[in-house]
Amino acid sequence: QGGTRSPRCDCAGDFHKKIGLFCCRGCPAGHYLKAPCTEPCGNSTCL
Protein backbone atom coordinates (compact mmCIF):
# COMPACT_ATOMS: atom_id res chain seq x y z
CA GLN A 1 0.00 0.00 0.00
CA GLY A 2 2.92 2.38 0.48
CA GLY A 3 3.31 4.19 3.72
CA THR A 4 4.99 6.74 5.86
CA ARG A 5 8.65 7.38 5.14
CA SER A 6 11.14 6.89 7.99
CA PRO A 7 10.29 9.35 10.79
CA ARG A 8 12.65 12.17 10.01
CA CYS A 9 12.21 15.42 8.16
CA ASP A 10 13.44 15.53 4.60
CA CYS A 11 14.03 19.29 4.45
CA ALA A 12 16.97 21.34 3.23
CA GLY A 13 18.96 22.87 6.07
CA ASP A 14 18.87 22.22 9.80
CA PHE A 15 16.41 22.68 12.64
CA HIS A 16 13.38 21.07 11.01
CA LYS A 17 11.18 18.80 13.09
CA LYS A 18 7.64 17.52 12.83
CA ILE A 19 5.25 19.86 14.63
CA GLY A 20 1.62 18.93 14.10
CA LEU A 21 1.01 17.87 10.51
CA PHE A 22 4.21 19.01 8.88
CA CYS A 23 7.96 19.19 9.19
CA CYS A 24 8.59 22.79 10.28
CA ARG A 25 11.58 24.97 10.95
CA GLY A 26 11.88 25.32 14.72
CA CYS A 27 11.91 28.59 16.64
CA PRO A 28 15.20 30.33 17.47
CA ALA A 29 16.50 30.25 21.04
CA GLY A 30 14.57 32.64 23.26
CA HIS A 31 11.41 32.43 21.12
CA TYR A 32 8.40 30.19 21.50
CA LEU A 33 6.07 28.55 19.03
CA LYS A 34 2.87 30.45 18.29
CA ALA A 35 1.73 28.25 15.41
CA PRO A 36 3.26 25.42 13.38
CA CYS A 37 3.88 25.71 9.66
CA THR A 38 1.10 24.89 7.20
CA GLU A 39 3.28 23.34 4.51
CA PRO A 40 6.14 20.85 4.49
CA CYS A 41 9.50 22.37 5.45
CA GLY A 42 7.79 25.68 6.15
CA ASN A 43 8.49 28.24 8.84
CA SER A 44 6.72 28.07 12.18
CA THR A 45 5.24 31.27 13.56
CA CYS A 46 7.43 32.22 16.51
CA LEU A 47 7.17 34.87 19.22
Epitope: I19, L21, P40
Partner: antibody, heavy 123, light 107 residues
Protein backbone atom coordinates in the same frame (compact mmCIF):
# COMPACT_ATOMS: atom_id res chain seq x y z
CA UNK B 1 -13.40 -1.59 11.16
CA UNK B 2 -13.17 2.20 11.29
CA UNK B 3 -16.48 3.91 11.99
CA UNK B 4 -17.23 7.63 12.17
CA UNK B 5 -20.70 8.87 13.09
CA UNK B 6 -21.45 12.59 12.96
CA UNK B 7 -24.29 14.29 14.82
CA UNK B 8 -25.46 17.72 15.93
CA UNK B 9 -26.47 19.21 12.61
CA UNK B 10 -29.48 21.52 12.71
CA UNK B 11 -31.20 24.60 11.32
CA UNK B 12 -29.68 27.70 12.93
CA UNK B 13 -30.14 31.44 12.54
CA UNK B 14 -27.33 33.61 11.07
CA UNK B 15 -25.03 34.68 13.89
CA UNK B 16 -25.93 31.58 15.89
CA UNK B 17 -23.78 28.73 17.19
CA UNK B 18 -23.76 24.97 16.84
CA UNK B 19 -21.54 22.12 18.05
CA UNK B 20 -21.04 19.05 15.89
CA UNK B 21 -19.81 15.71 17.20
CA UNK B 22 -18.14 12.75 15.53
CA UNK B 23 -18.08 9.47 17.47
CA UNK B 24 -15.17 7.29 16.36
CA UNK B 25 -14.40 3.60 16.77
CA UNK B 26 -12.17 0.92 15.26
CA UNK B 27 -8.82 2.70 15.61
CA UNK B 28 -6.52 4.25 18.24
CA UNK B 29 -8.26 7.61 18.46
CA UNK B 30 -5.57 9.53 20.34
CA UNK B 31 -2.85 8.83 17.78
CA UNK B 32 -4.87 9.62 14.64
CA UNK B 33 -5.33 13.02 13.06
CA UNK B 34 -8.89 13.98 12.19
CA UNK B 35 -10.54 16.57 9.98
CA UNK B 36 -13.87 18.18 9.21
CA UNK B 37 -14.79 18.57 5.54
CA UNK B 38 -18.00 20.17 4.32
CA UNK B 39 -20.01 19.82 1.14
CA UNK B 40 -21.87 22.94 0.10
CA UNK B 41 -25.30 22.86 -1.60
CA UNK B 42 -23.56 23.14 -4.99
CA UNK B 43 -21.75 19.87 -4.09
CA UNK B 44 -18.28 21.39 -3.67
CA UNK B 45 -16.02 19.89 -1.00
CA UNK B 46 -14.20 22.29 1.34
CA UNK B 47 -11.68 21.53 4.05
CA UNK B 48 -12.89 23.10 7.32
CA UNK B 49 -10.59 22.07 10.17
CA UNK B 50 -7.92 19.58 11.17
CA UNK B 51 -6.45 18.38 14.44
CA UNK B 52 -3.11 16.56 14.28
CA UNK B 53 -2.63 13.16 15.89
CA UNK B 54 -0.69 12.98 19.14
CA UNK B 55 0.21 16.64 19.64
CA UNK B 56 -3.26 18.03 18.78
CA UNK B 57 -2.28 21.15 16.82
CA UNK B 58 -5.26 22.70 15.04
CA UNK B 59 -5.56 24.15 11.55
CA UNK B 60 -8.28 26.12 9.74
CA UNK B 61 -8.81 27.83 6.39
CA UNK B 62 -9.23 31.62 6.48
CA UNK B 63 -12.97 31.25 5.81
CA UNK B 64 -13.65 29.80 9.28
CA UNK B 65 -10.62 30.91 11.33
CA UNK B 66 -11.71 32.63 14.54
CA UNK B 67 -15.28 31.28 14.21
CA UNK B 68 -14.82 27.49 14.28
CA UNK B 69 -12.91 25.39 16.81
CA UNK B 70 -11.95 21.74 16.36
CA UNK B 71 -11.28 19.67 19.47
CA UNK B 72 -11.27 16.08 20.64
CA UNK B 73 -11.96 14.07 23.76
CA UNK B 74 -9.73 11.00 23.82
CA UNK B 75 -11.65 9.47 26.74
CA UNK B 76 -14.87 9.58 24.70
CA UNK B 77 -13.27 8.88 21.28
CA UNK B 78 -15.13 11.90 19.98
CA UNK B 79 -14.20 14.76 17.67
CA UNK B 80 -16.02 18.11 17.91
CA UNK B 81 -16.52 21.19 15.79
CA UNK B 82 -17.74 24.27 17.65
CA UNK B 83 -19.17 26.73 15.15
CA UNK B 84 -19.97 30.34 16.09
CA UNK B 85 -21.01 33.49 14.20
CA UNK B 86 -22.58 31.25 11.59
CA UNK B 87 -23.24 32.63 8.10
CA UNK B 88 -25.49 31.45 5.28
CA UNK B 89 -22.38 30.30 3.41
CA UNK B 90 -21.69 27.79 6.21
CA UNK B 91 -24.78 25.84 5.08
CA UNK B 92 -23.46 22.40 4.14
CA UNK B 93 -23.22 18.73 4.93
CA UNK B 94 -20.36 18.33 7.43
CA UNK B 95 -18.22 15.18 7.34
CA UNK B 96 -15.53 14.05 9.73
CA UNK B 97 -12.64 12.05 8.32
CA UNK B 98 -9.47 10.37 9.48
CA UNK B 99 -6.27 11.53 7.84
CA UNK B 100 -3.59 9.07 6.91
CA UNK B 101 -0.02 10.32 6.85
CA UNK B 102 1.36 9.04 3.55
CA UNK B 103 4.77 10.71 3.79
CA UNK B 104 6.21 11.81 7.11
CA UNK B 105 5.42 15.44 7.83
CA UNK B 106 4.57 16.06 4.20
CA UNK B 107 1.43 14.57 2.67
CA UNK B 108 -1.96 13.22 3.78
CA UNK B 109 -5.03 11.46 2.44
CA UNK B 110 -8.48 11.35 4.05
CA UNK B 111 -8.93 7.62 4.29
CA UNK B 112 -12.20 7.13 6.19
CA UNK B 113 -15.28 9.38 6.13
CA UNK B 114 -18.45 9.48 8.17
CA UNK B 115 -21.93 9.76 6.68
CA UNK B 116 -22.22 13.49 7.41
CA UNK B 117 -24.52 15.78 9.38
CA UNK B 118 -26.50 18.60 7.80
CA UNK B 119 -26.17 22.24 8.89
CA UNK B 120 -28.51 24.90 7.52
CA UNK B 121 -27.95 28.56 8.37
CA UNK B 122 -31.06 30.56 7.53
CA UNK B 123 -33.46 33.07 9.03
CA UNK C 1 -3.88 28.45 -2.27
CA UNK C 2 -3.60 25.66 -4.81
CA UNK C 3 -6.67 25.55 -7.08
CA UNK C 4 -7.85 22.13 -8.27
CA UNK C 5 -9.88 22.07 -11.49
CA UNK C 6 -11.98 19.28 -12.94
CA UNK C 7 -13.07 20.69 -16.28
CA UNK C 8 -15.69 18.01 -16.92
CA UNK C 9 -18.53 18.33 -14.41
CA UNK C 10 -20.50 15.41 -15.80
CA UNK C 11 -19.69 12.46 -17.99
CA UNK C 12 -21.96 9.91 -19.64
CA UNK C 13 -20.64 6.46 -20.53
CA UNK C 14 -21.85 2.94 -21.23
CA UNK C 15 -21.25 -0.10 -19.04
CA UNK C 16 -17.96 -1.70 -20.05
CA UNK C 17 -16.51 1.57 -21.35
CA UNK C 18 -13.07 2.82 -20.41
CA UNK C 19 -13.59 6.15 -18.62
CA UNK C 20 -11.00 8.80 -17.83
CA UNK C 21 -11.56 11.75 -15.48
CA UNK C 22 -9.09 14.62 -15.43
CA UNK C 23 -7.88 17.02 -12.78
CA UNK C 24 -5.50 19.97 -13.02
CA UNK C 25 -3.66 21.78 -10.21
CA UNK C 26 -2.73 25.46 -10.38
CA UNK C 27 0.88 24.54 -9.54
CA UNK C 28 3.09 21.46 -9.31
CA UNK C 29 1.80 19.25 -6.48
CA UNK C 30 4.56 16.59 -6.52
CA UNK C 31 2.11 13.74 -7.12
CA UNK C 32 0.42 14.51 -3.76
CA UNK C 33 -2.94 13.85 -5.40
CA UNK C 34 -5.87 11.85 -3.98
CA UNK C 35 -9.07 10.66 -5.64
CA UNK C 36 -12.38 10.15 -3.80
CA UNK C 37 -15.64 8.55 -4.85
CA UNK C 38 -18.97 9.88 -3.57
CA UNK C 39 -21.96 7.61 -4.09
CA UNK C 40 -25.46 9.07 -4.68
CA UNK C 41 -26.31 8.38 -1.00
CA UNK C 42 -23.47 10.71 0.06
CA UNK C 43 -20.98 8.03 1.13
CA UNK C 44 -17.39 9.13 0.46
CA UNK C 45 -14.50 6.72 -0.07
CA UNK C 46 -10.78 7.20 -0.75
CA UNK C 47 -9.92 5.40 -4.00
CA UNK C 48 -6.38 6.42 -4.89
CA UNK C 49 -3.59 8.30 -3.11
CA UNK C 50 -0.16 9.53 -4.23
CA UNK C 51 -1.47 9.76 -7.82
CA UNK C 52 -1.55 6.03 -8.53
CA UNK C 53 -1.64 3.96 -5.34
CA UNK C 54 -4.83 2.00 -4.87
CA UNK C 55 -6.44 2.21 -1.43
CA UNK C 56 -6.98 -1.17 0.21
CA UNK C 57 -10.19 -2.84 -0.99
CA UNK C 58 -10.59 -0.72 -4.12
CA UNK C 59 -11.13 -2.78 -7.32
CA UNK C 60 -8.19 -2.98 -9.72
CA UNK C 61 -10.27 -1.50 -12.58
CA UNK C 62 -9.48 1.87 -10.99
CA UNK C 63 -6.11 3.41 -11.73
CA UNK C 64 -4.50 6.83 -11.51
CA UNK C 65 -1.72 8.61 -13.34
CA UNK C 66 -0.18 12.01 -13.86
CA UNK C 67 2.57 14.32 -12.67
CA UNK C 68 3.28 18.00 -12.15
CA UNK C 69 -0.07 19.73 -12.56
CA UNK C 70 -2.05 17.20 -14.64
CA UNK C 71 -3.65 14.05 -13.23
CA UNK C 72 -6.26 11.51 -14.24
CA UNK C 73 -8.38 8.69 -12.86
CA UNK C 74 -9.24 5.81 -15.18
CA UNK C 75 -11.89 3.10 -14.86
CA UNK C 76 -10.86 0.33 -17.26
CA UNK C 77 -14.35 -1.16 -17.63
CA UNK C 78 -17.28 0.77 -16.21
CA UNK C 79 -19.61 -1.10 -13.87
CA UNK C 80 -23.01 -0.09 -12.47
CA UNK C 81 -21.46 0.25 -9.00
CA UNK C 82 -19.13 3.00 -10.32
CA UNK C 83 -21.97 5.47 -10.82
CA UNK C 84 -20.86 8.27 -8.51
CA UNK C 85 -19.16 11.64 -8.39
CA UNK C 86 -15.36 11.67 -8.35
CA UNK C 87 -13.26 14.35 -6.66
CA UNK C 88 -9.54 15.02 -6.80
CA UNK C 89 -7.72 16.61 -3.85
CA UNK C 90 -4.23 17.87 -3.13
CA UNK C 91 -3.05 16.72 0.29
CA UNK C 92 0.10 18.61 1.11
CA UNK C 93 0.15 22.36 1.82
CA UNK C 94 -2.83 23.81 3.63
CA UNK C 95 -5.50 24.65 2.77
CA UNK C 96 -6.23 21.21 1.37
CA UNK C 97 -8.29 21.79 -1.75
CA UNK C 98 -10.64 19.70 -3.89
CA UNK C 99 -11.68 19.73 -7.51
CA UNK C 100 -15.30 20.53 -8.29
CA UNK C 101 -16.15 16.91 -9.00
CA UNK C 102 -17.07 14.87 -12.06
CA UNK C 103 -20.45 13.13 -12.00
CA UNK C 104 -20.42 9.84 -13.87
CA UNK C 105 -23.70 8.67 -15.38
CA UNK C 106 -24.81 5.71 -17.48
CA UNK C 107 -25.53 6.45 -21.16
Amino acid sequence: EVQLVESGGDLVMPGGSLKLSCAASGFIFSSYGLSWIRQTPDKRLEWVATISGGDSYTYYPDSVKGRFTISSDNAKNTLYLQMTSLKSEDTAMYYCATQREIYYGTYYALDHWGQGTSVTVSS
Amino acid sequence: DIQMTQTTSSLSASLGDRVTISCRASQDINNYLNWYQQKPDGTVKLLIYYTSRLQSGVPSRFSGSGSGTDYSLTISSLEQDDIATYFCQQGSPLPWTFGGGTKLEIK
